[in-house]
Interface confidence: medium
């Protein structure tokens, strides 16, 4: 198991591709001077500065990597999900633009 | 090139800390989460640490519980383990990795960099 | 912590001939939205490790396609179609569905 060692308690967090059985068990940084700043729900930046970043696809924060990313529409990929796949779906494949 | 380059291994009595350090070129290190990865001689691999991006997650299993910790400076490129209270079972060559990459629709496909790895021994 | 199983931990192949390595987990490495987060990574000797499959069967970059993945839930199986020379090293599965993040043994692939 994983040690849970909360310095504040974060929001309830999705882990591996946004959910997972087991919730990671972490120790969050920040001491006094940042405990009321950081009790406040963090901004989702695919609400802000990444509204319009996936082309063709949504975007998604995961929040307890604090990482942004694209889910993509069937047939596109890339980071932004803007470039369209010339191949057709083979079994190798099909899971890039699930 | 992506490349991390860890430092800061060596020869520790028990019960003394070390500093690793992993200095990261070649990508925008702070878009990814990182992870440290060790490996005891003639062993398998196991999960050290991982932090997220900005640095506010930090996770660790519990063989490592409260001795160390796990730190990054993205203006620096780079990522830290503070290692305390070491023992001889901690005697390992030390890698950094990168998770990611984070696109393709699901941001986690594993540890895609490693860097070279650093020696640290624990020994009287 | 999910217990990641490998065998066989020793497999010894003949040039051009297939290799399978099989990977049991003690849970399931399916999430709540259907993805499995079971990835191989091949380790050379004296080198460091590289990602060679992820999420059961995806071939990463650069990945010849003679590695192929398969399996799901608990049971996953990495395949070599025609081993070759360079192909020598130890073979481990990981999964990062859950935290703690764990790998196998590890399965040392020699030539004959």
């Known amino acids: 198991s994983v040690r849970v060692e909360q310095v504040v308690k974060p929001p309830q967090n999705k882990t591996e591709s946004e959910n997972t059985s087991d919730k990671p068990k972490r120790k969050k940084k920040g001491g006094k001077n940042g405990k009321n700043r950081r009790n406040r729900k963090k901004k989702n930046p695919c609400n802000a500065e990444f509204q319009n970043f996936c082309i063709h696809g949504e975007c998604k924060y995961i929040e307890h990597l604090e990482a942004v990313t694209c889910k993509c529409q069937q047939e596109y990929f890339g980071e932004r999900c803007g470039e369209k796949s010339m191949k057709t779906h083979s079994m190798i494949d099909s899971s890039l633009s699930k | 090139e992506v490349q991390l380059v860890e430092s800061g291994g060596g020869l520790v009595k028990p019960g003394g800390s070390l500093r690793l350090s992993c200095a990261a070129s070649?990508?925008?290190?702070?878009?990814?989460?990182m992870s440290w990865v060790r490996q005891a001689p003639e062993k398998g691999l196991e999960w050290v640490s991982t932090?997220?991006?900005?640095?506010?997650?930090?996770y660790y299993p519990d063989s490592v519980k409260g001795r160390f910790t796990i730190s990054r400076d993205n203006a620096k490129n780079s990522l830290y383990l503070q290692m305390n209270s070491l023992r001889a079972e901690d005697t390992a060559v030390y890698y950094c990795?990168?998770?990611?990459?984070?696109?393709?629709?699901?941001?986690?496909?594993?540890?895609?960099?490693w860097g070279q790895g650093t020696t640290v021994t624990v020994s009287s | 912590d999910v217990v990641m199983t490998q065998s066989p931990l020793s497999l010894p192949v003949t040039l051009g001939d297939p290799a399978s390595i099989s990977c049991r987990s003690s849970q399931s490495l399916v999430n709540q939205e259907g993805e499995t987060y079971l990835h191989w990574y091949q380790q050379r000797p004296g080198q460091s490790p590289k990602l060679l499959i992820y999420k059961v069967s995806n071939r990463f970059d650069g990945v010849p396609d003679r590695f192929s993945g398969s399996g799901s839930g608990t049971d996953f199986t990495l395949k070599i179609s025609r081993v070759e020379a360079e192909d020598v090293g130890v073979y481990y599965c990981?999964?990062?569905?859950?935290?703690?993040?764990?790998f196998g043994q590890g399965t040392k692939l020699e030539i004959k």
């Open positions: 070649g990508f925008t290190f702070s878009s990814y989460p």
């Open positions: 990795a990168r998770q990611g990459p984070i696109y393709y629709g699901n941001y986690y496909y594993g540890m895609d960099v």
């Open positions: 990981s999964q990062s569905t859950h935290v703690p993040y764990t």
């Open positions: 932090i997220s991006t900005g640095g506010t997650y930090t």
